[in-house]
Interface confidence: medium
């Protein structure tokens, strides 16, 4: 599923991401835009043999199990394929664990490079939330 901007903002808010660990909803929508272009089925392979999955591009080295990443920790205790569902519950629950891990949203390279320090509220402007 490819979400619309406001559709995703609403879904993320419903799942409790607004101001989760101090990160406003705009941060999460911005991260999703630049990680996956709002596509729940996005997958991208990394040079270390791991793969990033889903709307927030969650990595198989640490957070989920895809059955083929050497030394996978699977800290969210889920199959990576669950992160590709049109229902973003699994991605949101895992993202909450990631953002609580100490580095906050710096764990997402795209957020760090494209969203951090910008007007992230623009990503939810005009949305009926």
């Amino acid at each position: 599923k490819v979400f619309g901007r406001c559709e995703l903002a609403a879904a993320m808010k419903r799942h409790g991401l607004d101001n989760y660990r101090g990160y406003s909803l705009g941060n999460w929508v911005c991260a999703a835009k630049f990680e996956s272009n709002f596509n729940t089925q996005a997958t991208n392979r990394n040079t270390d043999g791991s793969t990033d999955y889903g709307i927030l591009q969650i990595n198989s080295r640490w957070w989920c199990n895809d059955g083929r990443t050497p030394g996978s920790r699977n800290l969210c205790n889920i199959p990576c394929s669950a992160l590709l569902s049109s229902d973003i519950t699994a991605s949101v629950n895992c993202a909450k664990k990631i953002v609580s891990d100490g580095n906050g949203m710096n764990a997402w390279v795209a957020w760090r490079n494209r969203c951090k320090g910008t007007d992230v509220q623009a990503w939810i402007r005009g949305c009926r939330l």
Partner: antibody, heavy 116, light 107 residues
């Protein structure tokens, strides 16, 4: 136990297309990548690409882009590989395998012969 | 693409001999190297995963070693059922690649 059952041997004419199937049993089909491998005598084993059945995400070896197309049907636990514009170079045994990085589980292979 | 070079291409041995098969990668692949045995008209069978871990049901006479670019599959006291082709495969990066194979034949 995990099993991958491939479709039977095919004899095709040059220029035609063929669709090979791989039915998986014994595990959660949607959560593991299915890989496709080509074997020709004297050419060893070649990785064609992979599909994640749960999402339909695919990756192809550059060499096989435009030649192979992967699909999967999670309702029947079956992965498919279509090969198009067949030539004699496509005559080979084609294997599906479960993608665990290594390949512990293989199909029995589908022999494709392209001949006029 | 990572190239895997296997040597020798053919190895002629007598049952009871011990042998070593080599697989060399064109760049470092850590321990992401796997070994397969294939007999005529059969699918490949996983022997060793991640350079040194024996796959389930594989006899202890098979062992693997190496890291980086140089890897070895050793068979201690070859048995008649061991004859066939042996391939290495890397999962360090895409595309996945295989070695050209070593044929283990009876002398």
């Amino acid at each position: 136990q995990v099993q991958l059952q491939e479709s039977g041997a095919e004899v095709m004419k040059p220029g035609a297309s063929v669709k090979i199937s791989c039915k998986a049993t014994g595990y959660t089909f949607s959560t593991y990548w299915i890989e496709w491998v080509k074997q020709r005598p004297g050419h060893g084993l070649e990785w064609i690409g992979e599909i994640l059945p749960g999402s339909g995400s695919t990756y192809y070896n550059e060499k096989f882009k435009g030649k192979a197309t992967f699909t999967a049907d999670t309702s029947s636990n079956t992965a498919y590989m279509q090969l198009s514009s067949l030539t004699s170079e496509d005559s080979a045994v084609y294997y599906c395998a479960r993608g665990d990085g290594y390949y512990c589980y293989w199909g029995q292979g589908t022999t494709l012969t392209v001949s006029s | 693409d990572i190239e895997l070079t296997q040597s020798p291409a053919t190895l002629s041995v007598t049952p009871g001999d011990s042998v070593s098969l080599s697989c060399r990668a064109s760049q470092s692949i850590s321990n992401n190297l796997h070994w397969y045995q294939q007999k005529s008209h059969e699918s490949p069978r996983l022997l060793i995963k991640y350079a040194s871990q024996r796959a389930s049901g594989i006899p202890s006479r098979f062992s693997g070693s190496g890291s980086g670019t140089d890897f070895t599959l050793s068979i201690n006291s070859v048995e008649t059922e061991d004859f066939g082709m042996y391939f290495c495969q890397q999962s360090n990066s895409w595309p996945r690649t295989f070695g050209g194979g070593t044929k283990l034949e009876i002398k």
